[in-house]
Each structure stands twice: as C-alpha cells, then as structure tokens.
C-alpha cells in the first residue's frame, strides 16, 4: 500500500506536463496577497535638525494580489532533467482589503538623497549633489503616495543630474511587466529528491553578491520541496527578494483545513551575527555599520541593489540587535506577527500555506557636504515598510488534497 502511494506521489510531483504538481506549479491555484505596512515618520524636522530618534507609526495594511500570472517561457530540458521559466511580476491593488487608497500620503526617508549620498562618497561630487538637492528643494524626508513609494515616481533631485541616470525611484520599481528569473529547476524525473531544487538562477549557480557559501543558490523557491519531508530536515530555499538563500526548521504540527502539515519557521539563528552563528560571517560585508560584525538582524543587500544602501530585516527589527532599533521609536516586534513560516504538507512537499514577512530599510549617514544630512550625528537604518506575503490553499483544493493524498494514506 505505502509503496504504491509513494510511487504515485513520486509520479505526481514531477514537474512535467500532465502531473498535479505541474498544473499548480505553472500557475498557482492559491490566491497570494502582499500586505504592506508603511512606516510614517512623525518628526522629520527634528530628525534632520537635531539628529533625534526617528518616530515612526506604521500604517496599513495596504493589500495587493500578487503571483497571479502563470510562469512564462516554460522549457523542459530532457538532457539534464530541468525545467526553466520566468516568474512574471504583477500586483493588483485590493481596496476592500486595505485601510486606504494608493493615493494615501506618507512621510518617508528621501530614497534618492539617502542613496546618492551613500553611492557618491567623493567630497567634490557631494558638493554638486548638495547644490542639486537644494535647487530641487529636496530634503532628508519626503511625502509620497503609496503608489509612488512602491511603484515609482520621478525624483526632482535626480532629474537635475546632468548625466544619464534613472530618474524614476520606487521601492519595487520596476515591477509590473517585469519577470524574475530565468530560473532553471530540476523537474525530478530522474531523481525525485531533487524536484523543484534550483539548478541555476539567471544562468548562474552563484549570486556574486556574497563571499563563500553565502553566495550559493540553495534549495527551492519555497513554493514546494522534494516529497517526504522529515521534521528533522533543514529546508533550504532561495528568495530573490532578499538576494540570498536561507533556511527553515520544523516548529510544530498544524492542522490546515483537515490536512496535517508541518510548520517550518525561519529561526532567529538565521539572522544572528557571526559571533553567535559563525556560518553567517559571509553575510557581513562591511565593518562600520555592522559594528565589526557584531550587529545582527539586518542584511546589507546593497550589492544586489546597484549600490543603494538597502537593508533587509524582519518586520519591526524582530531578531535584530538593540543598536539597530535604538534610533527608531515606535517599533513593537513580536514573533507571531512578524516571523516567516511555511506550512508544508510532508508527503508531497507542497507549501499549502505560508507567510513571508520582511522589512525594507534604507541606510542614511551624516554628510559634511550635504546640508540636509549635515546635522545628523549618527547612522540610521531607517524602516520604510514591511510586508506580509501570504497564501493559503483554497477550500476546494483542500478537499481535493484530502481525498487524493492525505485521505488515501490515513
């Protein structure tokens, strides 16, 4: 009996035309939503003038439907048993699941000012930047609508730069009509234990953002894992959002719509400093902001973002060192709301429910030559927003799953 089930499972989780896995893999049957909470800065003048703590107040959720587009350019390679694809990006605003509209205004860090002052450290260049910042009446902070902040706006300061630069700025710009990839993953035909594991991303087995093992593309994309998942396993997956591979460990048994699933969570150890977790040494890329690699809970992904000083963390700096959150008032981290988890059906390895949570932060540093940053007396890793991307198997699919998979076993 069990052998027959194993054989059926192995057959049905292969990523090729005609299998259950393939159909749901090409276009997810689950509705996926991405909720945003924006950190609205309450005291912009005091921060700029006196280097005060930044007082933030989160506003949200603002919800978008995402991952509704089918994978594109799906190409099987029979020779190495892989399938390659592009994952198109799309986001549709959901007013009924949001606290306001895309036209809501927020006071946030001026992304262009913070990034330009970080990228161009030369004193003479900073003097030029300063004159352009002044000419455009730009400041350390800015008021932007949700739509502008997420999807892009024409920056008045960058528009004055006398050589060709991208003048459109946005945390997720460009997004709609773009695609993530190319991904090339094992289809599992020759070896089911490799199914969905990424072989290459953008044609490479490494990212070229990190040193050593940190640069590796490990595991799957977290939408599914090879079947017959054990509680003792460490599940590796790659997330292009955070420009790195990461891992999840078993936390608890959960009943999801009558389906027994394993809840895997991202442990605090994954965000620890190299002092606590030596494996993380290669995620520490500089010594000053990281206080000689003793700070933890924030990941400098500037190499992956054309040099812009973007730092990724968990929402509200969950699992981050006190020095990171010390200059920011108004944060309340808690595990239940702010950690990432995956609920995996262990027989098939399918992720039937998930909550991916992350926070986007930007580093801003004092600058002698840039007046709007001149009064700062310390570095700030400024939270801009946090997001919660969730998906849960639908009732109909859950019924089908129960009858065809878990029901057969029980």
């Amino acid at each position: 009996g069990d052998l027959l089930i194993q054989k059926t499972i192995k057959k049905q989780v292969v990523l090729e035309e005609g299998t259950i896995a393939f159909k749901n893999w090409v276009k997810t049957g689950t509705e996926v939503y991405r909720q945003f909470w924006i950190f609205d800065v309450q005291n912009p003048q005091e921060v700029m003038m006196n280097s005060s703590n930044i007082q933030v107040k989160q506003r949200g959720p603002y919800t978008y439907r995402v991952r509704f587009l089918a994978k594109e350019n799906v190409t099987q390679d029979a020779e190495d048993n892989t399938v390659s694809f592009l994952q198109p990006n799309g986001a549709i605003f959901e007013p009924s699941l949001s606290v306001g509209t895309e036209a809501d205004n927020f006071t946030v860090l001026n992304l262009a000012v913070a990034a330009a002052s970080h990228i161009y450290q030369n004193q003479f260049v900073q003097m030029i930047l300063n004159s352009l910042i002044n000419k455009s009446k730009s400041s350390m902070f800015q008021v932007r609508t949700l739509r502008e902040l997420l999807w892009g706006y024409r920056d008045p300061f960058l528009s004055l730069v006398p050589y060709p630069v991208t003048t459109t700025v946005g945390l997720f710009y460009p997004y709609n009509n773009t695609a993530d990839g190319v991904y090339k993953v094992f289809n599992g035909k020759d070896n089911i234990s490799k199914v969905a594991i990424i072989d290459t991303y953008k044609g490479k087995r490494n990212l070229s953002y990190w040193e050593s093992h940190c640069d590796m593309i490990n595991g799957t994309d977290a939408a599914s894992f090879p079947p017959f998942v054990e509680k003792s396993q460490v599940l590796q997956f790659f997330s292009s959002d955070i420009c790195r591979s990461i891992y999840a460990v078993f936390e608890s048994d959960v009943n999801l719509k009558g389906i027994p699933v394993y809840r895997f969570v991202l442990p605090s150890k994954a965000f620890a400093s190299p002092v606590e977790n030596p494996d993380n040494y290669c995620f520490c890329t500089e010594k000053i902001i990281s206080k000689n690699c003793t700070s933890y809970g924030v990941l400098d992904i500037s190499k992956c973002k054309e040099g812009r000083p973007v730092y990724i963390s968990l929402p509200h700096f969950l699992y981050a060192s006190p020095d990171v959150s010390e200059p920011i008032d108004g944060l309340n981290p808690n595990e239940e709301e702010h950690r990432t988890y995956l609920d995996i059906e262990p027989i098939t390895g399918f992720t039937l429910q998930f909550a991916k949570r992350l926070q986007v932060n930007l580093l801003v540093k004092p600058s002698e030559k840039i007046q709007v940053l001149k009064n700062l007396k310390r570095n700030y890793i400024v939270p801009i927003l946090w997001l919660n991307e969730t998906g849960t198997i639908g009732d109909e699919k859950a019924n089908m799953f129960r009858s065809q998979v878990t029901g057969k076993i029980n």
């Epitope: 002044n134 902070f141 008021v143 007046q371």
Partner: antibody
Framework: QVQLQQSGPELVKPGASVKISCKAS????????MNWVKQRPGQGLEWIGR????????NYNGKFKGKATLTADTSSSTAYMQLSSLTSVDSAVYFC????????????????WGQGTSVTVSS | DVVMTQTPLSLPVSLGDQASISCRSS???????????LHWYLQKPGQSPKLLIY???NRFSGVPDRFSGSGSGTDFTLKISRVEAEDLGVYFC?????????FGGGTKLEIK
C-alpha cells in the same frame, strides 16, 4: 545684508522690447532662484517665472512663455528679464524676488524683493 | 494652476482690533519635501511686497509677534492680534509649492 536693486522706469513703444535688470548683493547669487513678478496698476501679483543663475535653468508661467525671457550673469550677480512685442497690457511694475533654499535651514519662499521697475507701453 | 482665493477683499478695522484673513488653495500645498509653502506678504502703497509669514506659521525676521499664521492642506489664516497704523495695506497670500507660483487676489486692511 540682502539687496536687490532694479533698473529704472521704462517708457517704450508698442511692439518694441525692453530688458530690465536686477542686481543682487549680500548672498550667493548663483545658488538661489530669482523670481519675477508682475503687478498692473491697482491689481494683484502675477508670477512670471524664475531662473537658477548657477546653470541658467528656468521655469515659466505658461501665460508668459514667449513674452518674457529670463537670463542671468553670475559674474555681475545680475538677473535680467526681457519683455518682447509689448502692448498696453504689459504696462505694469515688475519685481524681482529671490527664493533661497539652503538645505531646509533657510527656506523662506520669496523673502527679499527689488523695489520694482515700472514699464509703460505707450505710443 | 493652483488658484488662491483670499477673503475678504476688504477688511475695515479699528486700531487695536483683531484682524483675520483667510486664504484657500484649490489643491494641497504640502510639498514633497514635507514643507507647506504658503506665505503672507504685506504691500504698502508705492512699495514692494514684504514677507511677513513663511511656510504657514513662521514669522520672518523683524516681524512683530502680533502677526500669526495657521492652517494646513488647503485652508490658511493670517491673524493680527492688535492692529496698528503701520499694519495697513494690502495683504497677499502666496504658494510656492507648485510651479507656476500663484498669489491670492489681496485683502485691503483699512481703517473703519
């Protein structure tokens, strides 16, 4: 102290052009916008446009495009406005006014104004 | 263009009285740099306008504290707590958030 000294009154014929000047002192001329404002007798104020002397960048009120041309000479710290194809509706007092923005520390709008130049268009 | 509507057109007052002038804009004057560029000027006959209040509520240097400004978004007010003879003239509100900059039509403060 900041001073804006404008050129004297002008009496010009219809269809002609006139160029009025505004000499700045007491601040860094090249890094502050210079605005020009029109006021017809007994009327309100109308913004014509502005120039950034450092690079000659300009913004115009659509209504004055083709009528006014703004220029600046950083070596003499002087801003100029040329008005062309003059008609009676161009008879007015014209003011220059500086607009400083210094990293949020000095940010007052149009804080200092010239004394005004009267332009009379008459045949 | 942003339309600035000032009321009243004329404001007759007795010396020592309080005066209040309203200014309404056709769209929000909140600039992307977090400032609101709404200013108040006083113009006396034969003179150029003089800046009184900048960015809604800040008194320009040398302006007496009997002048105060308030408001946000699209609604703004200038108050003079005790009118003195030297305060008479035409008051203009102005916005420099959006190009082209625009002015209110003016309010003439005169003796009753």
């Amino acid at each position: 102290q900041v001073q804006l000294q404008q050129s004297g009154p002008e009496l010009v014929k219809p269809g002609a052009s006139v160029k009025i000047s505004c000499k700045a002192s007491g601040y860094t001329f090249s890094t502050s916008w210079m605005n020009w404002v029109k006021q017809r007798p007994g009327q309100g104020l109308e913004w014509i446009g502005r120039i950034y002397p450092g690079d000659g960048d300009t913004n115009y009120n659509g209504k004055f495009k083709g009528k006014a041309t703004l220029t600046a000479d950083t070596s003499s710290s002087t801003a100029y406005m040329q008005l062309s194809s003059l008609t009676s509706v161009d008879s007015a007092v014209y003011f220059c006014a500086r607009e400083v923005y210094y990293g949020g520390y000095e940010d007052y709008g149009m804080d200092y104004w010239g004394q005004g130049t009267s332009v009379t268009v008459s045949s | 263009d942003v339309v600035m509507t000032q009321t009243p057109l004329s404001l007759p007052v007795s010396l020592g009285d309080q005066a209040s002038i309203s200014c309404r804009s056709s769209q929000s004057l909140l600039h992307t740099n977090v400032n609101t560029y709404l200013h108040w000027y006083l113009q006396k006959p034969g003179q150029s306008p003089k800046l009184l209040i900048y960015k809604v509520s800040n008194r320009f240097s040398g302006v007496p504290d009997r002048f105060s400004g308030s408001g946000s978004g699209t609604d703004f007010t200038l108050k003079i707590s005790r009118v003195e003879a030297e305060d008479l003239g035409v008051y203009f509100c102005s916005q420099s958030t959006h190009v082209p900059y625009t002015f209110g039509g003016g309010t003439k403060l005169e003796i009753k």
